[in-house]
Interface confidence: low
């Protein structure tokens, strides 16, 4: 339904407080530089002309859309040129082409200090000083940090975060409090950055209809009790509201994607016997708890799925009638039958499925052509459940910093050209998944892993796209979605690679170690590490072990030493020396 | 408010064919899940097939897929059961019903629906 004014719609269906909040995450989402101060003032502008809207939609100008008074505010911001260069030339453009180039102007990596935690205390005083304030900051920085970040889930981790500092910080000892559950927080939401960032990247390289088939094998995992008509709806309504949020709408997506929550807790009899618990939630922890919810369990009489896609002999008939329509019959009853398999997977065997038909349906006997078709499946379902064995196998033998460098070595040999910084957060993240998916049933560990992964080689391409190194990376990044973890993982030492030249100044090391926390040093010799195999791609696992146990006792050592600057400045060379000759 | 009137219910023989029609009014028929049920004397309500509001996909039971086909006119904001290869067991009094939404898809709980017509008869018989 049309409103007069699209900004006193969303302002009296979001009401103040989230509709204040979404508008500074899409500030600070398109102009990642500017402080907060300056973004706070926008916001409280554009609340304020909501209000007028509201008030009288006929005032003027509030029949302008939400792109053109978002980027008429950004264009009026000065010295913007200055601070943003070509992103200025954009302001040149009319709508809807200025807020394309707003959008491709998004930094992914942007040039900004690491996102550092005050101390508790000092923390505290400014949450109780000022909640409004503090919580508006945070949304900043993640914001600007992210720009891809599903701004209503943002919301939600606003919320947790205020009710984390509500209750510690009337704790004695608040730091004690805060720590394990701010960074319970700060994990969650990373982990939702590079998986919505994946999202927004599926949408924007291969349209709507790549991500609506995500979704349709995603709810039907979820929701086997579901009809196939009514996850079409489901997945048609998050596929509108994730390309609203990737495309810039975030007041539309996040208002869309409360109505959909209303709309699943009204009709849980033919979604899900798992919703009533969050439809007991207010609106931001129901969609979010609705988003993350258990599956269902799958109806006991389900026949064989062989029935209508292989032995019906009007197969070829019913795929020539309606491709998508029967594909996504396909992929719905494949997947509602597999909650043990990954989204990646599910949509592997469909294209799988697809490709067999279009060969078989054109030729003379297409049952006898398609019959195998479920048991060529196998071998794609193989490799990723050997992945996970592998991998799972390795990480509970290494545990999680020794299996971090185990995929440091192994990522670097494949793409030795990629930036050492850009390597060590790759594998530092994919060496999370160890963590995250390997302690769980299993089950649910092939989904958990191969999930995680492709979202975190996302990030690894979206990185890459910005400065491209490397053929091999450009290859698998460049092809489809689903077969990116597979194309990574088939990847092997970089033959045509020049091994770098050893330089005595990149294992040079100082006293500063010993005083960094113990993640920062880790990232110190996971950088050793990588610049290690730079230098000698072939190094074998022992050579590699051999050195870093050198360098791991030369910085305990010195660290302890009386004199810790001497200890670095005599013992640092004669480790250097003795790790080329182990290299040699 | 959606007013739904049925029309096209009579007597038929085994084989033979029968086109039956739903009128909405107060609310345009593309913006809502509609369906037809049947209710055989002694008998529960039965869903018979039904297509989506805004999704334009069809949902039969399988007792009548290949012989009925549900389709609706939105100019004339009407709605179709076209029923072939009629069969005695199909005797029942016939029920259109909606479930309006943006856009909400079939279901075959009829519970789900809140508007229905008032039904018209098919007597399938030699």
């Known amino acids: 339904e049309a409103h007069k004014s699209e900004i006193a719609h969303r302002f009296k269906d979001l009401g103040e407080q989230h509709f204040k909040g979404l508008v500074l995450i899409a500030f600070s989402q398109y102009l990642q530089k500017c402080p907060y101060e300056e973004h706070i003032k926008l916001v409280q502008e554009v609340t304020d002309f909501a209000k007028t809207c509201v008030a009288d939609e006929n005032a003027e100008n509030c029949d302008k859309s939400i792109h053109t008074l978002f980027g008429d505010k950004l264009c009026a911001i000065p010295k913007l040129r200055d601070n943003y260069g070509e992103l200025a030339d954009c302001c040149a453009k009319q709508e809807p082409e200025r807020n394309e180039c707003f959008l491709q102007h998004k930094d992914d990596n942007p040039n900004l200090p690491p996102f550092q935690r005050p101390e508790a205390e000092a923390m505290c005083t400014s949450f109780q000083e000022n909640p409004t304030s503090f919580l508006g900051h945070y949304l900043h920085e993640v914001a600007r940090r992210h720009p891809y970040f599903y701004a209503p889930e943002l919301l939600y981790y606003a919320e947790k975060y205020n009710e984390v500092l509500t209750q510690c910080c009337t704790e004695s000892d608040k730091a004690a409090c805060l720590t394990p559950k701010l960074d319970a927080v700060k994990e969650k939401a990373l982990v939702a950055a590079v998986r919505q960032r994946m999202k927004c990247s599926s949408m924007q390289r291969f349209g709507e209809r790549a991500f609506k088939a995500w979704a349709v094998a995603r709810m039907s995992q979820r929701f086997p009790n579901a009809e196939f008509a009514e996850i079409t709806k489901l997945a048609t309504d998050v596929t509108k509201i994730n390309k609203e949020c990737c495309h810039g709408d975030l007041l539309e997506c996040a208002d869309d994607r409360a109505e959909l929550a209303k709309y699943m807790c009204e009709n849980q009899a033919t979604i899900s016997s798992k919703l009533q618990a969050c439809c007991d939630k207010p609106v931001l922890q129901k969609s979010q708890c609705l988003a993350e919810i258990e599956h269902d369990n799958i109806p006991a009489d389900l026949p064989s799925i062989a029935a209508d896609f292989v032995e019906d002999k009007e197969v070829c008939k019913n795929y020539a009638e309606a491709k998508d329509v029967f594909l996504g019959t396909f992929l719905y009853e494949y997947s509602r039958r597999h909650p043990d398999y990954s989204v990646s997977l599910l949509l592997r065997l469909a294209k799988k499925y697809e490709a067999t038909l279009e060969k078989c349906c054109a030729e003379g006997d297409p049952p006898a052509c398609y019959g195998t078709v479920l048991a060529e499946f196998q071998p794609l379902v193989e490799e990723p459940k050997n992945l996970v064995k592998t991998n799972c196998e390795l990480y509970e033998k290494l545990g999680e910093y020794g299996f971090q460098n185990a995929v440091l070595v192994r990522y670097t040999q494949k793409a030795p050209q990629v930036s050492t910084p850009t390597l060590v957060e790759a594998a530092r993240n994919l060496g999370r998944v160890g963590t995250k998916c390997c302690t769980l049933p299993e089950a649910q560990r092939l989904p958990c892993v191969e999930d995680y992964l492709s979202a975190i080689l996302n990030r690894l391409c979206v990185l890459h796209e910005k400065t491209p190194v490397s053929e091999k990376v450009t290859k698998c990044c460049s092809g489809s979605l689903v077969e990116r973890r597979p194309c990574f993982s088939a990847l092997t030492v970089d033959e045509t690679y020049v091994p770098k030249e050893f330089k005595a100044e990149t294992f040079t090391f100082h006293s500063d170690i010993c005083t960094l926390p113990d993640k920062e040093k880790q990232i110190k010799k996971q950088t050793a590490l990588a610049e290690l195999v730079k230098h000698k791609p072939k190094a074998t696992e022992d050579q590699l072990k051999t050195v870093m146990g050198d360098f791991a006792q030369f910085v305990d050592k010195c660290c302890k030493a009386a004199d810790k600057d001497n200890c670095f400045a005599t013992e640092g060379p004669n480790l250097v020396a003795r790790s080329k000759e182990a290299l040699a | 408010e959606v007013q739904l009137l049925e029309s096209g219910g009579g007597l038929v023989q085994p084989g033979g064919s029968l086109r039956l029609s739903c009128a909405a009014s107060g609310r345009y028929i593309d913006e809502t899940a509609v369906a037809w049920f049947r209710q055989a004397p002694g008998k529960e309500r039965e869903f018979v097939a039904g297509?989506?509001?805004?999704?334009?996909?069809?949902y039969y039971a399988d007792s009548v897929k290949g012989r009925f086909t549900i389709s609706r006119d939105n100019s004339k904001n009407t709605l179709y059961l076209q029923m072939n290869s009629l069969r005695p067991e199909d005797t029942a009094v016939y029920y259109c019903a909606a479930r309006p939404g943006k856009p909400l898809i079939t279901s075959k709980v009829a519970d789900l629906y809140p508007y229905w017509g008032q039904g018209t008869l098919v007597t399938v018989s030699s």
């Open positions: 297509i989506g509001g805004g999704v334009d996909i069809t």
